[in-house]
Amino acid sequence: NECPELQPPVHGKIEPSQAKYFFKDQVLVSCDTGYKVLKDNVEMDTFQIECLKDGTWSNKIPTCKIVDCRAPGELEHGLITFSTRNNLTTYKSEIKYSCQEPYYKMLNNNTGIYTCSAQGVWMNKVLGRSLPTCLPECGQPSRSLPSLVKRIIGGRNAEPGLFPWQALIVVEDTSRVPNDKWFGSGALLSASWILTAAHVLRSQRRDTTVIPVSKEHVTVYLGLHDVRDKSGAVNSSAARVVLHPDFNIQNYNHDIALVQLQEPVPLGPHVMPVCLPRLEPEGPAPHMLGLVAGWGISNPNVTVDEIISSGTRTLSDVLQYVKLPVVPHAECKTSYESRSGNYSVTENMFCAGYYEGGKDTCLGDSGGAFVIFDDLSQRWVVQGLVSWGGPEECGSKQVYGVYTKVSNYVDWVWEQMGLPQSVVEPQVER
């Protein structure tokens, strides 16, 4: 018995293609590239029908439906734009992922262009079906930092957004009677990590051993400008407190630490990371000018409540910044060795300030970032962390501020943050 003539579906074909089909003949229905066989609302690659004994086909010819990649996956800190009208997501449609500029940029400068493949998957030429990654932009404040031509800026008010990496770290040990409270500064390195000085996060209850404060006692404020107004600031608790394993309380060698935030903070004009330097033992060159910001609240007679609640007795309600030159290492070493006491300026430290002194050399809080503008990458880089030399002898003649040389610890920092350096280096300094 002969079966009726078959008409292939639109965008499809039948094989074998014959003039006549008889009992027990079988045909395979398939679709063009970018289309799928649709039968009873079920998508398949091919569909087989057979000529029956009574001269009828075992099934109706299915249709060919264009492949649909459906809505593309959400990209954290990113946006999607459709290149086709009506936001089509079908075969050969194109979409473009982009990052929320200027706060994030795409890793490896990927184009972000994805095409809907015949397999129904969004595909990128480099990443395949993997989504791109939006990394925080670093060292590019939404407001331009002042030119570094003038020799000194003594205690100038910082405009909001000038130091978007600046963090206020509040430590409040409620297990002590009375509660022990202190503060320091830090620098945002990514949406989840703060760089600071180890001595800020060390419990002073123990002097023989180095013990970090409990993470429950740490609060970090970001985007804070005026301590009297915290409404615009983001506050976060700590998930981890990591002191450098070799931190030495005798001489503050390896005075560096990290705080991992409980939740990543949203980046914006007032909250942006600073860049890490390249790994270079020399550190910043002598006489280079850098900036340090702080609220000047290292005064031990000011309580946290006064800072965070009223801010009335702080040395400065508004974030201040100061411009300081890097001092040649030998000169700094000599200046400390000439004084009584066993002060040692190690190779993990550098000094900044002025020979003639002046209180402008100690506005930065402990742990705050000493940043230098990198001409090559056109970004601000954290070269130092406020470590010692103040506040106790703040601004004395020929008593320079001593800073942790961050460039000696780049590998350690990346290791703690769990990011391979090769992945993130392009966003740091290129």
């Epitope: 202190w182 002073q204 209850r205 023989t208 051993t209 503050y252 031990p300 066993n342």
Partner: antibody, heavy 116, light 112 residues
Framework: QIQLVQSGSELKKPGASVKVSCKAS????????MSWVRQAPGKGLKWMGW????????TYADDFKGRFVFSLDTSVRTPYLQISSLKAEDTAVYFC?????????WGQGTLVTVSS | DVLMTQTPLSLSVTPGQPASISCKSS???????????LNWLLQRPGQSPKRLIY???KLDSGVPDRFSGSGSGTDFTLKISRVEAEDVGVYYC?????????FGQGTKVEIK
């Protein structure tokens, strides 16, 4: 070299106040807490408490709560012990010692005599 | 408060001979950080105290190696292998594990 230099001996009348100072040098002052220890004539040592030199927060042993106050002037690297409403039994040598718990360096001591 | 009990309260030693002082605490001095904050100091006549040993057995810099510390939990010992004339004074143990820190009553060492 690390040194803790205390103020000189004091002779006070009962009910008066005294302030003992302890100037520190030779180390990063805010790195170590400062303890205060009392030694009554012919007696042993008694720990009074300590002050966190970074935060300025004092902690007192129970026997020294009330009339005893630890304070700091960080700019001159000096902790202070103030005793108010002095009593005859406060007569003692008062030592400052570097560290909240370490007490690795000691001042030379300040004799406070309370006598009418 | 943790009670620190020293024995003997006084000790008369011939120069060159060994000496041993015991210090017992009313509670274990092992802290939650796995360290034992038991220390020894010497107060020479008319002088301020000087720490000799910290964390049970670690010698402070400049302390002669004839001094040694040992012990764990609640029982601790300071030993002087060969007593010298400059070792006279009162030896105190103290603990920095449990607040408030407490001292032993002292052991007076003199030369025969």
């Amino acid at each position: 070299q690390i040194q803790l230099v205390q103020s000189g001996s004091e002779l006070k009348k009962p009910g008066a106040s005294v302030k003992v100072s302890c100037k520190a040098s030779g180390y990063i002052f805010t790195s170590y807490g400062m303890s205060w220890v009392r030694q009554a004539p012919g007696k042993g040592l008694k720990w009074m408490g300590w002050i966190n030199t970074y935060s300025g927060v004092p902690t007192y042993a129970d026997d020294f709560k009330g009339r005893f106050v630890f304070s700091l002037d960080t700019s001159v690297r000096t902790p202070y012990l103030q005793i108010s409403s002095l009593k005859a039994e406060d007569t003692a040598v008062y030592f400052c010692a570097r560290g909240g718990e370490a007490m690795d360096y000691w001042g030379q001591g300040t004799l406070v005599t309370v006598s009418s | 408060d943790v009670l620190m009990t020293q024995t003997p309260l006084s000790l008369s030693v011939t120069p060159g001979q060994p000496a041993s002082i015991s210090c017992k605490s009313s509670q274990s001095l092992l802290d939650s950080d796995a360290k034992t904050y038991l220390n020894w100091l010497l107060q020479r006549p008319g002088q301020s105290p000087k720490r000799l040993i910290y964390l049970v057995s670690k010698l402070d810099s400049g302390v002669p190696d004839r001094f040694s510390g040992s012990g764990s939990g609640t029982d601790f010992t300071l030993k002087i292998s060969r007593v010298e004339a400059e070792d006279v004074g009162v030896y105190y143990c103290w603990q920095g594990t449990h607040f408030p820190w407490t001292f032993g009553q002292g052991t007076k060492v003199e030369i025969k």
